[in-house]
Interface confidence: medium
């Protein structure tokens, strides 16, 4: 038995519903009383959800998955996962058995945004040309783990001197604190950019020095 | 270049049925998802549903479920918004767009439009 | 599905001057928020995505910026070809509905 899934990864955003695609091709005069089917985790091979008897006999995956009853006389054996965590990426397994048997994996790539960066900056006073100073960039709550890059006002990257943690949260969000130190020109623009892999969202943050006083570009 | 070139202006009748097409280039066409979007005469956007071309996978907007399909031929990168029986409040200017190659993403590139006109 | 609602529907500003335009979620779509510009008898254009990401080739005066519910599109300084209609789009989840739009015209 052919059981059909998508090539590439599903992508869902953190709270949101995903549909992990699965179908096969039923024989003429299938009737769902014939139909085992079950979804589990394919490295753990714990049961998510599984319909067998005529029977949606349920989710067995936190009450946070359903199927299309509707649809499954037709061969469609998609999954539904409600609110995605970062806990749920991974391969799931969808098995089909009729008179015979077959199965495909398909996999659920979570992704989040990360928000606007913050800035700071140590010393944040008295500031003089020569002086070095501790650039701090922190932006919070995103999945995967970030690229973060540095550039100077004329676009320049900075790449020295930069250290970059990534922190995951309880809900595998991840905080990220780029800093960078740096000897003080004149006056001078640094930008920070977030970057999530996945979904190619860049995300910046900067902040202005010249001289006295020094100024914070407003929230746009 | 990214480009999505919509077929021509139509005039139909209503009960008629209808299919109209958007050609994509200068890109992997099964690995994007490609939409539609309605905009009547006067009014603003409305969000119909998107396909992804590699699998055939579509989501509906709830609006839109049932009145018409989306559809995709790998083999000439097309995509295809269709009505089976068209209505007089069909009528309107249809935009194909291409999202990202993730499902989660907006519409960067639009086609030029393709104006449906439904009326007896 | 998730409502968006912009405001004000029409704004009247001077060339030269900053425009602000609002849109609001019925529900949270974290920063995944689009902004189109439409002009007449053209396709709309992408200008913002992911709440503040500027679209390939749009101008630095066009800024954007919000999370959640609440997201705001700043032109800081409106050129004559600003004036056209901008409208918001969630791209959280489907189906990624539309504000009904604001129409930024001449003062």
């Known amino acids: 038995l052919e059981v059909q899934v998508p090539e590439d990864p599903v992508v869902a955003l953190v709270g949101t519903d995903a549909t992990l695609c699965c179908s096969f091709s039923p024989e003429p005069g299938f009737s769902l009383a014939q139909l085992n089917l079950i979804w589990q985790l394919t490295d753990t091979k714990q049961l998510v959800h599984s319909f067998a008897e005529g029977q949606d006999q349920g989710s067995a995956y936190a009450n946070r998955t359903a199927l299309f009853p509707d649809l499954l006389a037709q061969g469609n054996a998609s999954l539904r996962l409600q609110r995605v965590r970062v806990a749920d990426e991974g391969s799931f397994t969808c098995f089909v058995s009729i008179r015979d048997f077959g199965s495909a994996a398909v996999s659920l790539q979570v992704a989040a945004p990360y928000s606007k960066p913050s800035m700071t900056l140590e010393p944040n006073k008295d500031l003089r040309p020569g002086d070095t100073v501790t650039i701090t960039c922190s932006s919070y709550r995103g999945y995967p783990e970030a690229e973060v890059f540095w550039q100077d006002g004329q676009g320049v990257p900075l790449t020295g001197n930069v250290t970059t943690s990534q922190m995951a949260n309880e809900q595998g969000l991840f905080d990220v604190h780029s800093v960078l130190r740096v000897v003080l020109g004149a006056n001078g623009t640094y930008s920070c950019l977030v970057r999530n892999p996945v979904l190619q969202q860049d995300a910046h943050g900067s902040v202005t020095i010249t001289g006295q006083p020094m100024t914070f570009p407003p929230e746009a | 270049e990214v480009q999505l070139v919509q077929s021509g202006a139509e005039v139909k009748k209503p009960g008629e049925s209808l299919k109209i097409s958007c050609k994509a280039s200068g890109y992997t066409f099964t690995t994007y998802w490609i939409g539609w979007v309605r905009q009547m005469p006067g009014k603003g956007l409305e969000w119909m549903g998107i396909?992804?071309?590699?699998?055939?996978?579509?989501r509906y907007s709830p609006s839109f479920q049932g009145q018409v399909t989306i559809s995709a031929d790998k083999s000439i990168s097309t995509a295809y918004l269709q009505w089976s029986s068209l209505k007089a409040s069909d009528t309107a200017m249809y935009y194909c767009?291409?999202?990202?190659?993730?499902?989660?993403?907006?519409?960067?590139?639009w086609g030029q439009g393709t104006l449906v006109t439904v009326s007896s | 599905e998730i409502v968006m609602t912009q405001s004000p529907a029409t704004l009247s500003v001077s060339p030269g001057e900053r425009a602000t335009l609002s849109c609001k979620a019925s529900?949270?779509?974290?920063?995944?928020l689009a902004w189109y510009q439409q002009k007449p008898g053209q396709a709309p254009r992408l200008l913002i995505y992911w709440a503040s990401t500027r679209a390939t080739g749009i101008p630095a005066r066009f800024s954007g910026s919000g999370s959640g519910t609440e997201f705001t599109l700043t032109i800081s300084s409106l050129q004559s070809e600003d004036f056209a209609v901008y409208y918001c789009q969630q791209h959280y989840d489907t189906p990624y509905t539309f504000g009904q739009g604001t129409k930024l015209e001449i003062k």
């Open positions: 529900r949270g779509v974290s920063t995944a």
């Open positions: 396909i992804y071309p590699g699998d055939g996978g579509s």
């Open positions: 767009a291409r999202g990202g190659n993730y499902i989660s993403f907006p519409m960067y590139y």
